[in-house]
């Protein structure tokens, strides 16, 4: 480690004094200190002498001697004060630049250590520091503003009390730069654009950053466009905007447009597609099947996707029958915009009633004309069953009528004893009717089928049951012959005489 003579940590002299600083090391040595006038340097092998015969306040500072050949990088330092009664401060730099949250050293060096008790940091012209400015002072180095903020970018002065008089340093400008988190933020509007040939169009590309140093450009199909740039500053961000105005678009204007912005952190880009069409268009579609089946009492949402340019001039949902002349309630119709040219229209049909089955049509209109999309809604019903005893062609016959949707299947059961419903243990015989006769089958209505069971002799201690089922549910009717005639049992009901 080099050694400095005089071997004191600090030296105090008056202006005009002669100062000689000698550094000795094992190998060659070098001096480093504040840039100031009047120093002469003399080197002789392993020693180096720094001297002045007319010290001024500007020579105030820390002088460090290093030995470049030392692998440990050792150094020695001495601090020189040149105490000028008229100049309490030696300012080493008039501009300091730091990033936010770094410590900012304002290098005003005190020329007389005795003055340390009366120093303060102020903004220029004596104004107090901003609130929450946390700072410390070192007579060797100056004032340090800790964790500097962008708002603390100000002009500062160091103040010392000399004989009851506040003496100010020259000002030091602090520039606190915002930490640039990444490339500039971008917006490109619109995200998608459609125009008819001959119409006007506007595309706006804008970029913003906490720092003013960034570039932005707009390109069309990889060709950079020459557009005048507008600049602004608000919300603590710098903004640069490029606006492309096209008075009469043609097919060559169509294609991909990219907004690109870059700074020291990198590049961001975002794209949009511009479509030029010959004339207005209106397309209706649905992701759903246009033929819908829903169980009665349940709900259904009918959704239509609309692609249109220009925008819709009118739209509505209409019920086309066949039941009542009721129309869908407007409050149940909902429109959502996916983007500028695509919309979704939903009709909510909660707790569907039998009279609400039928055709629902969505109609839309724009300058391109009218379009319609129609849904057919059929309601599903669990089977309803009834049984009667009758004679057909002189033969005793049980006649079972089942009505529901989809078309019910029919099964006959014969079981011992009198019961509302045959269970497995009681069943004597089972007949499936694969092809019951269809009595009625109209669109949007229940299907009614009829099944006949010819019984030569009714066994009086037995029950005949007609069961019908479909994908929604099942229904049954029990027929109990008794001596006085025949009695039928609808499920869970009292016996009755037909």
């Amino acid at each position: 480690i080099p050694v400095i003579e005089p071997s004191v940590p600090e030296l105090v002299v008056k202006p005009g004094a002669t100062v000689t600083l000698r550094c000795v090391g094992n190998g060659s040595v070098e001096w480093d200190g504040p840039p100031s006038p009047h120093w002469t340097l003399y080197s002789d092998g392993s020693s180096s002498i720094l001297s002045t015969n007319n010290a001024t306040f500007q020579n105030t500072g820390t002088y460090r001697c290093t030995e470049p050949g030392d692998p440990l990088g050792g150094s020695a330092a001495i601090h020189l004060y040149v105490k000028d009664p008229a100049r309490p401060w030696n300012v080493l730099a008039q501009e300091v630049v730091v990033f936010e949250d770094q410590d900012a050293l304002l290098p005003c060096l005190l020329t007389d250590p005795v003055l340390e008790a009366g120093v303060s940091l102020v903004r220029v012209r004596g104004r107090p520091l901003m609130r929450h400015t946390n700072y410390s002072f070192s007579p060797w180095h100056g004032f340090t503003i800790h964790r500097a903020k962008f708002i603390q970018s100000q002009d500062y002065q160091c103040s010392a009390l000399m004989g009851g008089r506040k003496v100010m340093s020259i000002s030091i400008r602090l520039k606190v730069q915002k930490v640039i988190p990444g490339p500039p933020a971008l917006t490109l509007v619109p995200a998608e654009l459609v125009r008819i040939r001959g119409e006007a169009a506007q595309i706006v590309c804008s970029a913003s950053s906490v720092d003013v140093n960034f570039d932005v450009f707009l390109q069309h199909n990889n060709t950079k466009l020459a557009i005048p740039q507008q600049s602004d500053f608000h919300n603590n961000r710098y903004q640069k905007v490029l606006t492309l105005n096209l008075d009469q678009v043609d097919f060559q204007h169509a294609g991909n447009y990219s907004c690109v912005a870059s700074n020291v952190q990198g590049k961001h880009s975002t794209s949009m597609f511009f479509r030029v069409v010959e004339s207005a268009y209106l397309n209706l579609s649905s992701e759903q099947n246009l033929i819908q089946e829903v169980t009665v009492g349940e709900g259904l949402n009918l959704k239509v996707m609309v692609e249109a340019y220009p925008g819709l001039q009118g739209f509505n949902w209409t019920y086309l029958g066949p039941f009542s002349d009721h129309q869908p309630e407007p409050k149940l119709a909902n429109a959502t915009t996916k983007d500028t040219y695509r919309h979704t229209f939903t009709l909510s049909l909660p707790r569907l009633k039998p009279s609400e089955a039928g055709r629902y049509s969505f109609l839309a209109r724009n300058p391109g004309g009218w379009r319609a999309l129609t849904f057919e809604l059929t309601l599903r019903y669990p089977p309803e069953v009834s049984v009667i005893w009758t004679f057909i062609n002189g033969s005793g016959t049980l006649l079972c009528a089942a009505s529901g949707y989809p078309q019910p299947n029919v099964t006959w059961l014969q079981c011992s004893g009198h019961t509302d419903r045959c269970d497995e243990a009681q069943v004597l015989q089972v007949w499936d009717d694969p092809y019951p006769e269809v009595l009625s089958q109209e669109p949007f209505h229940k299907v009614t089928v009829q099944s006949l069971l010819t019984v030569e002799t009714l066994e009086h201690n037995q029950t005949y049951e007609c069961r019908a089922h479909n994908s929604v549910g099942s229904g049954s009717w029990a027929f109990i012959p008794i001596s006085a005639g025949a009695h039928t049992h609808p499920p869970d009901e009292f016996l009755f005489t037909p």
Partner: antibody, heavy 119, light 111 residues
């Protein structure tokens, strides 16, 4: 020779606006801080506003804060004071003055321009 | 209300010595802030007469001198001349107001 010449004064109605200018010559304008100081008729001097050499620091007296805006154009050696929402009490001769950084004095003054706010 | 207090007027015969006082407080003159003096001749702009309590800019005659003590300062004019008839203002910085402050001015009449 240091010279400061103000212009832009005149008669304005209450609530109106006016822009004062100060043309500087004879010194390195871009190195010096500048101020506006006013003097109501028959009254004393009142400091109005300050701007640092590079416009990085600006101060206003409480009486004009939010209504007046100080600015400078170092390329044109000019100082400005934009005065909005003027009141009768703003009637005064307005001086531009060069500030001395080390002791907060004003070493050179212009001849002044009269602003009269009256209906 | 003025922060720095000056007598409204003083007078003296030619050749005489007059002093103008400027009284402040612990937040301005008493806090160590310099006092400056300005001369305003009738119908003209103010002119710096004394800066930093007692310093004269070049061109200002040595008949003008300034001093400061505690919370007060004073301007002395010796060998009074007719052309000294003017308004004189003291100025300092006030740390509680955070702005430059002027005295109310003193009218000097040369009898």
């Amino acid at each position: 020779e240091v010279q400061l010449v103000e212009s832009g004064g005149g008669l304005v109605q209450p609530g109106g606006s006016l822009r004062l200018s100060c043309a500087a010559s004879g010194f390195t304008f871009s190195n010096d801080e500048m101020n506006w100081i006013r003097q109501a008729p028959g009254k004393g001097l009142e400091w109005v506003s300050y701007i640092s050499s590079r416009s990085s620091t600006i101060y206003y007296a409480d009486a004009v804060k939010g209504r007046f805006t100080i600015s400078r154009d170092n390329a044109r050696n000019s100082l400005y004071l934009q005065m909005n929402s003027l009141r009768a009490e703003d009637t005064a001769v307005y001086y531009c003055a060069r500030g001395v950084e080390s002791d907060f004095s004003f070493d050179y003054w212009g001849q002044g321009t009269l602003v009269t706010v009256s209906s | 209300q003025l922060v720095l207090t000056q007598p409204p007027s003083v007078s003296g015969a030619p050749g005489q010595r007059v002093t103008i006082s400027c009284t402040g407080s612990s937040s301005n003159i008493g806090a160590g802030y310099d006092v400056h003096w300005y001369q305003q001749l009738p119908g003209t702009a103010p002119k710096l007469l004394i800066y930093g309590n007692s310093n004269r800019p070049s061109g200002v005659p040595d008949r003008f001198s300034g001093s400061k003590s505690g919370t007060s300062a004073s301007l002395a004019i010796t060998g009074l001349q007719a052309e000294d008839e003017a308004d004189y203002y003291c100025q300092s910085y006030d740390s509680s107001l955070s702005e430059e402050v002027f005295g109310g001015g003193t009218k000097l009449t040369v009898l």
